[in-house]
């Protein structure tokens, strides 16, 4: 007999990168007839909602209308259908941006490289911080963390046209509370190979996620997402 | 010390092919892309191309596209240019540099003569 | 392809001036600019990377500056053996391009 029902699926939109004092919605996905569904954060319970008709709703949305230092972190739901309960989600990790100021992120050797040359990006930023993020725009999005006190250095070690796109860094005091986005670098890989072994694993986002967090920062629109696997938060822990 | 060792000069006839080395040493031939770059006859630099010596990707200057042609031989931490259908207008010093961010390191240089 | 304009085109100089070189890109480079140094009869030489980060070895009478597309490269005091040729380098895109040269000589 089944003890426990599926694991809800939990997202933010219109992205989980949230300037603050925007508006943010916290979205869970579970089962028709769900009677229950209980948003948890860092742990606790957060947010409870009960969707009437429950045999026509799958989906519930937990609306945070002032996004702030205090509302970034880890989320979870689960829903309940009669007296089972689910599963708890994965852990969606909320992040606020704009808590300092922009970084400058820059490339070496140059945003122009060959095919095989050994390419670094450098996240620079003055005011006092810890923690560097380094992201790809795009569907196929790369995350990485850099740590230093005023500069990180992320190598991408030999890159590939796979590599190519734009890039921007953030500055960070902690997992959850970023800087403004630096300026975008734009990343050309040239060159044709015989050998194409070296192209990265890169982690994937099912929709550009950038491009929504984009809207988020200049019109604070809206804008409805596929829900994705989670691989970007897992990068963030 | 970084070492960028290139062949002696040469002095050819028009229409002719020609192949210049550039031997390096002291650093990882694999870990930095090779550039070439011609020096006419009192004038400024021009950049021909480069390549990546781990994998052999190349990029050139379309200006030398059908000209030059880059590779290099892993084994013995060499690059070379090879130049083909030449004309007077190929008569020039070409060196190889590292590129290191910038061109941090060059070739002493080699004098092409191209004369009938 | 970004053109790389150098001016003077010819400096001519005591020792002990400070003197400043001129280097314009036809389109923004960020700091992807590159000085280098090229004596008579010898292969260039780097001076300042990135527009304005020293080099080991090069005399500190050597900097740079600028960023975008107007750079300077400066000699605080010009020693005899600063003769020579001075090119600026666009490291941003391919293809990469070099100024047309500044020639330093003494008066």
């Known amino acids: 007999q089944q003890q426990t029902l599926p694991k809800p699926f939990i997202w933010a939109e219109p992205h989980f990168m949230v300037p603050k004092e925007k508006q943010v919605t916290i979205c869970c996905q579970g089962n028709y007839g769900a009677v229950e569904y209980q948003l948890h954060f860092e742990g606790s319970l957060f947010a409870v909602d009960r969707p009437k008709p429950p045999e026509r709703i799958n989906k519930v949305k937990f609306y945070i209308p002032d996004m702030n230092s205090r509302m970034a972190g880890q989320y979870s739901c689960i829903y309940r259908v009669g007296e089972l309960w689910s599963e708890p989600s994965n852990l969606l990790d909320l992040v606020v941006t704009e808590m300092a100021d922009t970084p400058t992120l820059s490339v070496h050797p140059g945003p122009e490289v060959i095919s095989g040359e050994k390419v670094t990006f450098y996240c620079r930023l003055d005011t006092a911080t810890s923690m560097f993020l380094l992201l790809k725009e795009g569907r196929s999005s790369h995350v990485q963390r850099g740590y230093g006190k005023v500069q990180a250095e992320f190598p991408l070690g030999p890159v590939t046209t796979a590599h190519r796109g734009t890039y921007r860094c953030f500055g960070s005091a902690n997992n959850h509370a970023w800087s403004f986005p630096s300026e975008p670098v734009k990343l050309l890989v040239t060159g044709d190979i015989e050998n194409t072994s070296l192209a990265p694993e890169d982690p994937t986002f099912p929709a550009d996620t950038w491009g929504t967090y984009l809207l988020t920062t200049e019109t604070g629109l809206q804008k409805d997402h596929a829900l994705w696997d989670h691989t970007a938060q897992n990068l963030l822990r | 010390e970084v070492q960028l060792q290139q062949s002696g000069p040469e002095l050819v006839k028009p229409g002719a092919s020609v192949k210049i080395s550039c031997k390096t040493s002291?650093?990882?031939?694999?870990?930095?892309?090779m550039h070439w770059v011609k020096q006419s006859h009192g004038k400024s630099l021009e950049w021909i191309g480069g390549i990546s010596p781990n994998i052999g990707g190349t990029s050139y200057n379309q200006k030398f596209k059908g000209k030059a042609t880059l590779t290099v031989d892993k084994s013995s931490s060499t690059a070379y240019m090879e130049l083909r259908s030449l004309t007077s207008e190929d008569s020039a010093v070409y060196y190889c540099?590292?590129?290191?961010?910038?061109?941090?390191?060059w070739g002493q240089g080699t004098t092409l003569t191209v004369s009938s | 392809d970004i053109v790389m304009t150098q001016s003077p085109a010819t400096l001519s100089v005591t020792p002990g001036d400070r003197v400043s070189l001129s280097c314009r890109a036809s389109q923004s480079i960020s700091d992807y600019l590159h000085w280098y140094q090229q004596k008579s009869h010898e292969s260039p030489r780097l001076l300042i990377k990135?527009?304005?980060q020293s080099i080991s070895g090069i005399p500190s009478r050597f900097s740079g500056s600028g960023s975008g597309s107007d750079f300077t490269l400066s000699i605080n005091s010009v020693e005899p053996e600063d003769v020579g040729v001075y090119y600026c380098?666009?490291?941003?895109?391919?293809?990469?391009?070099f100024g047309a040269g500044t020639k330093l000589e003494l008066k």
């Open positions: 380098q666009n490291g941003h895109s391919f293809p990469l391009t």
């Open positions: 002291g650093y990882t031939f694999t870990e930095y892309t």
């Open positions: 540099a590292r590129r290191g961010g910038s061109f941090d390191y």
């Open positions: 990135y527009a304005s």
